[in-house]
């Protein structure tokens, strides 16, 4: 049994880190493998993660961590029974992938503006709360080429766009993702998308 692609891990900088890797051949990850992880300091407790399959040769493990802080560094040992397949380390604060924003809502009650709001995925006492910026993807359901990205570089999780910049009488979808500047993180996953109908009509004299 051999590791083809070594584990790579990302942390949500709260309590969950996710590690993914590929094996040399088809593997029943949960039956054959265990990922052991231990905080590097004195003789900290060793924890065990049971991986799941992620495609034929891929495995994924969700490591539960007791409140990740900046100082934490973990050793990782990938075992197949009594055989150590791989040994590495992982510092969560240096491999942050933010949680996805939630509660994306579209407000169209203001006549000429589409207002999108969403929730910051972190509580205010987390350092990432004031460090997130966002990308909002809006696309035309009937024409995938009619797609745009709006970068939201201010802290407030809102975006206003003139309804006139969208085609009238068309259904649009939007989704949002986040990243943290200070930590130079990867982008979060996209939020679930939300749909609305653009009923905006230009004033008669502008037609």
């Amino acid at each position: 049994m051999k590791v083809l692609q070594e584990p790579t891990c990302v942390s949500d900088y709260m309590s969950i880190s996710t590690c993914e890797w590929k094996m040399g051949g088809p593997t029943n990850c949960s039956a054959e493998l265990r990922l052991l992880y231990q905080l590097v300091f004195q003789s900290s407790e060793t924890h065990t993660c049971v991986p799941e399959n992620n495609g034929g040769v891929g495995c994924v493990c969700h490591l539960l961590m007791d409140d990740v802080v900046s100082m934490d560094n973990y050793t990782l040992d990938l075992w197949a029974g009594q055989q150590l397949l791989w040994k590495g380390s992982f510092k969560p604060s240096e491999h942050v992938k933010p949680r996805a924003p939630g509660n994306l809502t579209v407000h169209t009650n203001v006549s000429d503006t589409v207002l999108l709001t969403w929730s910051n995925p972190y509580p205010p006492d987390n350092y990432l709360y004031n460090d997130l910026t966002y990308a909002v993807n809006i696309w035309n359901e009937n024409d995938l080429a009619d797609s745009r990205i709006h970068n939201v570089t201010y802290l407030k999780p809102t975006l206003r766009i003139p309804a006139s910049t969208l085609k009238s009488g068309i259904s649009y979808r939007a989704r949002v993702r986040a990243w943290a500047q200070h930590y130079n993180t990867t982008w979060s996953e996209w939020s679930p998308s939300t749909k609305w109908y653009n009923s905006y009509r230009e004033p008669f004299e502008q037609r």
């Epitope: 300091f41 007791d66 409140d67 100082m71 560094n73």
Partner: antibody
Framework: QVQLQESGGGLVQPGGSLRLSCAAS????????LTWVRQAPGKGLEWVST????????LYADSVKDRFTISRDNAKNTLYLLMNSLKPEDTAVYYC??????????????WGQGTTVTVSS | DIQMTQSPSSLSASLGDRVTITCQAS??????LAWYQQKPGQAPKLLIY???RLQTGVPSRFSGSGSGTSFTLTISGLETEDLATYYC?????????FGQGTKLEIK
């Protein structure tokens, strides 16, 4: 606002025990790692011990490991430090400290006023 | 363990002076550095976190810079109330460590 109030310090003989408490208010106690820092007379700051928010992880300086035990009661918003086998070099002002954000252990934005522990015969 | 070395260990400066205190880490700590001020008989007070971020309520004459292994705390115009001992602290790896302190006196 955040308040941290230590108590339990005093004079104790070498080899004796003491339990320090830190009563906290003004923040969500159960969301933060909390730390004890000490300062010997005329000396600098020294990290003693940290307990993570849920209490599952405890960390100690080598100088106190196996003698001191940090614990917390999230229902009572109180942090503790049980000090056994005390030595004269444990004589110091003991501070409890809270980090600015819950994903830091240090970067202490709030400190108690300190409680004095004197180990002497 | 990461050693934090402050220099100078003490300094004397005049009111209005620009004062610089440095902190050297024995290995890279990215920007996980905090600066504290401690006045006699008081608990320490956080001035700077994340290497350069000013804590709320701290006068703007205080500033922090640096990343990696070399950090600086600057007081741009020394005032009487700045008489204190200043400590740096790394938040990068266990165990948490402080510098030995820099005692600032007013000439």
């Amino acid at each position: 606002q955040v308040q941290l109030q230590e108590s339990g310090g005093g004079l104790v003989q070498p080899g004796g025990s003491l339990r320090l408490s830190c009563a906290a208010s003004g923040f969500t106690f159960s969301s933060y790692s909390l730390t004890w820092v000490r300062q010997a007379p005329g000396k600098g700051l020294e990290w003693v011990s940290t307990i993570k928010a849920r209490g599952g992880t405890t960390l100690y300086a080598d100088s106190v490991k196996d003698r001191f035990t940090i614990s917390r009661d999230n229902a009572k918003n109180t942090l503790y430090l049980l000090m056994n086998s005390l030595k004269p070099e444990d004589t110091a002002v003991y501070y409890c400290a809270k980090p600015l954000y819950n994903n830091f252990a240090g970067h202490f934005g709030s400190w108690g006023q300190g409680t004095t522990v004197t180990v002497s015969s | 363990d990461i050693q934090m070395t402050q220099s100078p260990s003490s300094l004397s400066a005049s009111l209005g002076d620009r004062v610089t205190i440095t902190c050297q880490a024995s290995q890279s700590i990215s920007s996980y550095l905090a600066w504290y001020q401690q006045k006699p008989g008081q608990a320490p007070k956080l001035l700077i976190y994340g290497g350069s971020r000013l804590q709320t309520g701290v006068p703007s004459r205080f500033s922090g810079s640096g990343s990696g292994t070399s950090f600086t705390l600057t007081i741009s115009g020394l005032e009487t109330e700045d008489l204190a001992t200043y400590y740096c602290q790394q938040d990068y790896s266990w165990p948490l460590t402080f510098g030995q302190g820099t005692k600032l006196e007013i000439k």
